[in-house]
Structures are given as C-alpha cells and as structure tokens.
Interface confidence: medium
C-alpha cells in the first residue's frame, strides 16, 4: 500500500488555538483502517474521518480543532496490510504561543529585612523567552533571559511580586507571589489539664497564630501560686501540643502557663491556669478483722485506721467485700468499724475483706477473713484456713 502524509511538510508550525487537519493518503487498499499515531501512541478517537476517493484510494483526516502545547509532537499514520504495519513518514507538529510558565514565583514568609530569592522560568516555542520582574505595580530591572532568579535584600512589609515572560508571540504574566513578614507567635489558648493524679498532670493547649514561621517548641511553667517560685519548667518540641508534668507533690495547689516559640522568638505567656494534684490513697489496711455470729446474722469488726501521712487527707468510709463459693458476692460501704452482714448463706464458706477509703480511692485490702460454714465465728488468715470449735 502506498502511504503518505499529504500537504504537510516534515515540520508543521501552528499557533496555539488554531485548527489543524492532517491528511493521510492510502492507495492500493480497498478498506484501509487508518490509524493515527502521536509520539508512538495510537490516537484513539472519533475525530478521524475518511474520504473514499476511489475503491483503491482513501484519504484519512485527523482533525484538531484548537491545538495546544500538549498536541505538539511527532505524528504519522499507519495501516495494516497483510499482517504487516506500514507507516508513513512523520510530521513534526510544533505549537507556538505566548510563553508558558514552568516555574512561577511562590509565596514566602521571611523575617524583616532578611534577604530572599524568587524564581521564574518560562518556555516557548518560539524562543527566546525573556523575563521581566514586577514589585507591586513597579517594574524592577530590565529583561533577563529565562530562567531568572530575583535576589531581594529584604522587605519591611508584606510585598507582592510577579514576573512577565515575553517572546515573539506576546507576553504572559505569572501568578502574584506574596512575601509576608514573619512575626513572633501569638500566645497559646484553650489550655487544659486533661489528666490528674497525685504526682502527675497532663496538659494540652491550642497554638496561637504561628507568625508565619514554624513553631519549634512550647514552654510549660509551673508554680505553687500564680507568680510564685517556679517549681518546674518543661520545654517540649511541638507538635503535638501536649506535655506530661511529673514528680508533683500530692494534694497540692499549682498554677501553670504556656508559651510557644518560632525562629524569631517566644510568644507571650498565656494566662495562669490553676490545678490541684490528687492526694494519696490510704497506705494501711484495717487490722484485726474478726466475725461474731449472732442469731440475726454475722457482725464484723476491725480496728480503726489512723492516717499515716497528712497527704492521705481525712479517711472516709470503709469498704467491705465478701464472697461465697456458690458465687454470691457483694460490697458494703460502712461509716464505722463494725458491720452487720446479711444476705449470706450460713451453709457456705464466706471470705471477707475490708479497706479504708478517702477522696482518692481505697487503700490496701485487709487480710481475708474466712468464716467456715462449720464455724460459729471466723478468724483472719489464709483464705482456706479454718477454725473449728
């Protein structure tokens, strides 16, 4: 089959936005299936048209309504003939237009009077492409070949920059880059003590505006009274905006405040936030737990627990826990050192423990008391010890 691209030179240069029709003539085949290929890839689309000139002569068209840069490349047509693919000579399609930016100036944030650079690059065809820089509405410097780097010694306020690219087809303007001034960060806010124990406190906060410079760290300052002696100062890398304060004194009033810093320096401190650590749970278990059987049930008695340390605070009610081997169990809260136990099965063994509680929680359990179903009373000892009459 005779195959040729008609009416197209080896190089075809078209302006962006113009239509292009590539014609491919095929002779010596009755029903050619003409395929168009661009840069080695088949152009699969319904824009392809055919003229049957005669039984053995066809003209195929590839119609591009409005060419753009992405249409530029090497085109050819091809047909299958007897199992072999025959290809035409190629045509190089060049799309000319106003410059196309490959690099545009980016927004920046810089410290006052600090030097910085902006970059701009644009390409044709046609070449050459020259770059002109603008600072706001003022042209700065003469045309420079693309690519161009603008060196700025510094700014004292937010300033806008753009570049303009020129070639024989006209000019194109880049995006406008805003160069912002960096500043100290704003104070953090929403400072919350999220978890409290007797010796630890977890703190979380929201960062204020970063002053257009990355926040590097935050400082948590702790005192025992607002403005009093500093007990603790913790510097934490951020994010996350959290901190664990350790080794605090139980049942103590504290205040904390937070500030954060970027490369330019620290923010103001946020307002003081008061908090109080929890006291200690009781350290001692009730002693001498014993039982007295009566006709109406079982009376349990134990010795009063005296606070060992002031940090334990006032000791509150006692908690009594009992269980039987039939699975029955219960807990009682009693104010004194004596409890009347009901609702248990005298035919089953009974195990009883007691602890003293305060605002923090319950202290250690006493030694378990085993009341045997054979006993008229019980005594403290290992869970399976028995006392018989």
């Amino acid at each position: 089959a005779g195959l040729k691209l008609m009416g197209a030179p080896v190089k075809l240069t078209v302006s962006q936005g113009q239509p292009v029709k590539l014609n491919c003539s095929v002779e010596g085949m009755e029903e050619p299936d003409i395929q168009w290929v661009k840069d080695g890839a088949v152009v699969q689309n319904l824009d392809q048209l055919y003229i049957p000139v005669s039984e053995q002569h066809w003209i195929g068209f590839l119609s591009l309504k409005s060419v753009e840069r992405s249409d530029a490349g090497r085109y050819w047509c091809q047909v299958e003939d007897g199992g072999e693919t025959e290809i035409s000579q190629p045509v190089w399609l060049t799309v000319e237009g106003v410059p196309f930016f490959t690099v545009e100036p980016k927004d920046l944030a810089v410290p006052p009077n600090a030097p910085f650079q902006l970059s701009c690059e644009a390409v044709g065809p046609p070449e050459p492409v020259t770059i002109v820089w603008w600072r706001g509405t003022t042209k700065i410097g003469g045309p420079a070949p693309s690519p161009s780097v603008l060196n700025v010694t510094g700014v004292t306020q937010s300033t806008m920059f753009s570049c303009e690219a020129h070639n024989l087809k006209g000019l194109a303007s880049s995006r406008t880059a805003t160069v912002h001034l960096q500043a100290l960060p704003a104070a953090p806010f929403n400072i919350t003590v999220t978890k409290l124990s007797s010796s630890n406190a977890s703190v979380a906060w929201m960062p204020g505006a970063d002053g257009r410079a990355l926040l590097q760290s935050c400082t948590v300052q702790v005192t025992q009274a607002p403005g009093g002696w500093e007990v603790l100062a913790v510097v934490v890398p951020v994010p996350p905006f959290t901190c664990l304060l350790r080794d605090l004194v139980p049942a103590t009033n504290y205040s904390l405040r937070v500030r954060c810093a970027n490369a330019l320096g620290p923010s103001p401190y946020a307002d003081w936030v008061p908090f109080q650590t929890k006291g200690l749970a009781p350290a001692s278990a009730p002693q001498n737990l014993h039982a007295i059987r009566t006709d109406s049930g079982l009376i349990l008695e134990w010795e009063e627990v005296i606070p060992e340390a002031p940090l334990e605070g006032p000791l509150g009610p006692y908690k009594l826990s009992w269980v039987q081997d039939n699975g029955t169990q219960d807990e009682l809260t009693v104010e004194g050192t004596r409890a009347n136990l009901t609702g248990w099965d005298p035919q089953k063994d009974l195990i009883v423990r007691v602890c003293v509680s305060n605002a923090v929680g319950c202290g250690p359990w006493s030694q378990p008391l085993v009341v045997s179903s054979h006993d008229r009373a019980g005594q403290q000892g290992p869970p399976h010890s028995r006392t018989s009459w």
């Epitope: 029903e31 299936d33 049957p52 409005s66």
Partner: antibody
Framework: EVQLVQSGADVKKPGASLTISCQAS????????ISWVRQKPGKGLEWMGA????????YYGPSFQGHVTISADRSTATAYLQWRSLEASDTAMYYC??????????????????WGPGTLVPVSS | SYELTQPPSVSVSPGQTARITCSGD??????AYWYQQKSGQAPVLVIY???KRVSGIPERFSGSSSGTMATLTISGAQVEDEADYYC???????????FGGGTKLTVL
C-alpha cells in the same frame, strides 16, 4: 439513495435478551461508521456507541458500556444492537445512524446525516 | 462522565433572533454539531464543525463557538423552525459522543 432499514420489536419483559438490526443500502457499507442513538419517550437524544467501518473497533458511551453490544456483519451490510438482559428503563426509540465519513467530494462531513426510522423497544412486566 | 448543557427552552416571536447555547468543558478542543428534531421525526443535521452550515439548510441558521460555549443562532426565526435542537460533540479524549439535553424552541 442511502437507506437504513431498522427491524421492529415486540413488547419484552425485563430480563429478556434482544437484538435489533439496521440494514444499510445505497452506499458501500464499509465506507462509513454506524452509530446508535437512544431517545426515551419525551426525552432527549443519547449517544450509545459506534462501530468502525470494518467492524474492528467499537466505542461506547459511559452509561452504556457493558449493558449493550454493538456489532456488524459486512456481508449483509447490517449493524446490530444487542442486550443480554433488558430493563424497564431500556424502553425507548433506538436510531441507527451512518456517521464518521466524508462525501465523495470531501467537503461535508456526514456526521449523523443519515438516520434510520428508529426501532421502538417497549420493555414491561 | 462528560456533559453538554443546554437551556431547556427558548421562546421568540416570528422574525426575532433565537440563540441556543451549549456549554461543555471540552468545547475549546472539540467541534460542536447542531441537530433539529421536529415532532415524530428523526433528527436533521443543521450545523457541523461549530459554524459550517449543511447544504439545503436556510441561511438564517448559523453557528459559533468561543471557549466552552457553542451557540446556534436563528436570525429571523420562522414558525417552521419550531422544534427541539440538540448540540453534539465528543468527550475530551475523543472516545465517545455526547448530546446536550436539548432545547425546545417555541416561535410564538
């Protein structure tokens, strides 16, 4: 004179299969593409798909891909539109259209200039 | 999937100019085609490749295209021009065709 003669269709139940045909005359069948266009009652035109001159390539609209099959028999100059499983929403008029070629003078693209009379496909339970 | 958007209806008095628009993201790169469909009939091609009039179509029919909008203009509309008008184009990759939703032209 270019003519596209389309087959008729009886009422079909949902789930049934169906093939409708479009026989071309008055021109060389392999000089042109055949496209299919749907028009639901009281609604607009919808491009369904097309088959190339020699039957080697088929294109489908996204809404019809996988739901219909377009084929052609060059020996009888007939194009076909086939459903494996009809749905009530397939009730419509279906046109076959000669397309994608040029007149012998090479001046007017015959984009959908020759239309068949249409085949009404009613699908109802 | 790709869509072409047309106004559902346009009304003009006889002798006035009717304009029917068709918008689609691929229209800067793909040609628009316009069809006229009268009640109970198959569609008829009126305009091809944005602005070329099919032979036998009255000169009052013209087409244009700018950016993502194609326009069919009927200068001095006649009562016999009352019909549904559809734009047609290709999706951006050229692999399927799309009709607009259609515009009902009423010539009062």
């Amino acid at each position: 004179e270019v003519q596209l003669v389309q087959s008729g269709a009886d009422v079909k139940k949902p789930g049934a299969s169906l093939t409708i045909s479009c026989q071309a005359s008055g021109y060389t069948f392999t000089d042109y593409w055949i496209s299919w266009v749907r028009q639901k009652p009281g609604k607009g035109l919808e491009w369904m798909g097309a088959i190339s001159r020699n039957g080697s390539t088929t294109y489908y609209g996204p809404s019809f891909q996988g739901h219909v099959t377009i084929s052609a028999d060059r020996s009888t100059a007939t194009a076909y539109l086939q459903w494996r499983s009809l749905e009530a929403s397939d009730t419509a008029m279906y046109y076959c259209v000669r397309s994608g070629g040029l007149t012998s003078g090479g001046t007017i693209p015959e984009y959908y200039q020759h239309w068949g009379p249409g085949t009404l496909v009613p699908v109802s339970s | 999937s790709y869509e072409l958007t047309q106004p559902p209806s346009v009304s003009v008095s006889p002798g006035q100019t009717a304009r029917i628009t068709c918008s689609g993201d691929a229209l800067p790169k793909k040609y628009a085609y316009w069809y006229q469909q009268k009640s109970g009939q198959a569609p008829v091609l009126v305009i091809y490749e944005d602005k070329k009039r099919v032979s036998g179509i009255p000169e009052r029919f013209s087409g244009s295209s700018s950016g993502t909008m194609a326009t069919l203009t009927i200068s001095g509309a006649q009562v016999e021009d009352e019909a549904d008008y559809y734009c047609y184009s290709l999706a951006v990759d050229g692999n399927y065709g799309v009709f607009g939703g259609g515009t009902k032209l009423t010539v009062l």
